[in-house]
């Protein structure tokens, strides 16, 4: 035997206890699909949480965190502090990055600097706080009578002129 | 800010058609179903019709079940309400709202009279 | 069809009282009832849903409970503007119907 309350859309609810029809979802709730026996609680977004989208009879409402925040889990389900560029969030706060890491977002974990000699390359721009280093060409491309399609640029030692 | 506004209401002789619309905004209309309720001068509310928010599932009070029709364009954010064979008992501000029953346009009057 | 009946018809009474309006249902319908309050030449106003949830912006002198058959509308306090009609309604079965309203009137 069918169901007859798979016949009743989204924004509705069926109880098999009674007359097999669909009733509209009461105020604040929702079913987003068709045939629910029970509509859904909508969710509000209090506190740190904002509202990104707001609830229907079809849908639920979907959150984002207020500023100074950014979101976490599925479908945002936390929020966590943002730290400045160049910190790592920890228990304690916000804490800036240890020598030799660094974080360009306000987000996530402090990461270490690339190695550039594990490319064979060598350190063009240092890293800090905020920023990975940059690599550069390897020393062997830095040599004498090595072919390159555009040639590096003259290297210069600190506190001398160009002749 | 939601909003509800019909029109279309007016006189009309009994056995005449009317089309009313309402206008909804401030909201995503498509992702609700809509009512249709009504009041007779002086009285209480009535029930008219229902459909859902994709427009597939409808019902109607047996009042006017077989005269009226029910619909909706979500492009247009508009709900209607096509009324023919109208008689002096259909007389009534009529409004829509949300199928919440939260939000309800100001009504328009629609009068069957000779 | 599920009828509703609501008492009293008139509700007579000063600003400060309190008021008890009632809502009877001929058959049970869970919690599904809502309470709406209207003015003279507006449209009705959404107060309490589900029985005894405040809707939005709603004052919290008005509260709202029962289950099953029998409801009830406490104004704890009446306020000059809360003189209208009050409707319920119930949105458990189809047709959705309303009960005849409660007036309430200064005294």
């Known amino acids: 035997l069918q169901d007859l309350c798979s016949n009743c859309p989204a924004g509705t609810f069926c109880d098999n206890n009674r007359s097999q029809i669909c009733s509209p979802c009461p105020p604040n709730s929702f079913s987003s699909a068709g045939g629910q026996r029970t509509c859904d609680i909508c969710r509000q977004c209090k506190g740190v949480f904002k509202t990104r989208k707001e609830c229907s009879s079809t849908s639920n409402a979907e959150c984002d965190c207020i500023s100074g925040y950014h979101c976490l889990g599925a479908e945002c389900s936390m929020c966590e502090q943002d730290c400045k560029q160049g910190q790592e969030l920890t228990k304690k706060g916000c804490k800036d990055c240890c020598f030799g890491t660094f974080n360009d977002q306000k987000r996530g974990i402090c990461r270490p600097w690339t190695n550039c000699s594990l490319d064979g390359k060598s350190v063009l721009v240092n890293g800090t706080k905020e920023r990975d280093v940059v690599c550069g060409p390897s020393p062997a491309d830095l040599s004498p009578g090595a072919s390159s399609a555009t040639p590096p640029a003259p290297a210069r030692e600190p506190g001398h002129s160009p002749q | 800010e939601v909003q509800l506004v019909e029109s279309g209401g007016g006189l009309v002789q009994p056995g005449g058609s009317l089309r009313l619309s309402c206008a909804a905004s401030?909201?995503?209309?498509?992702?609700?179903?809509m009512h249709w309720v009504r009041q007779a001068p002086g009285k209480g509310l009535e029930w008219v019709s229902y459909i859902s928010s994709g427009g597939s599932t409808i019902y109607y009070a047996d009042s006017v079940k077989g005269r009226f029709t029910i619909s909706r364009d979500n492009a247009k954010n508009s709900l209607y309400l096509q009324m023919n064979s109208l008689r002096a008992e259909d007389t009534a501000v009529y409004y829509c709202?949300?199928?919440?029953?939260?939000?309800w346009g100001q009504g328009t009057l629609v009068t069957v009279s000779s | 069809e599920i009828v509703l009946t609501q008492s009293p018809a008139t509700l007579s009474l000063s600003p400060g009282e309190r008021a008890t309006l009632s809502c009877k249902a001929s058959e049970n319908v869970g919690s599904y009832v809502s309470w709406y309050q209207q003015k003279p030449g507006q449209a009705p106003r959404l107060l309490i849903y589900g029985a005894s949830n405040r809707y939005t912006g709603v004052p919290a002198r008005f509260s709202g409970s029962g289950s099953g058959t029998d409801f009830t509308l406490t104004i704890s306090s009446l306020e000059p503007e809360d003189f209208a009609v009050y409707y319920c309604?119930?949105?458990?079965?189809?047709?959705?119907?309303f009960g005849g309203g409660t007036k309430v009137e200064i005294k």
């Open positions: 309604g119930q949105s458990y079965s189809y047709p959705l119907t």
């Open positions: 401030g909201f995503t209309f498509s992702e609700f179903g």
């Open positions: 709202a949300r199928d919440w029953v939260d939000y």
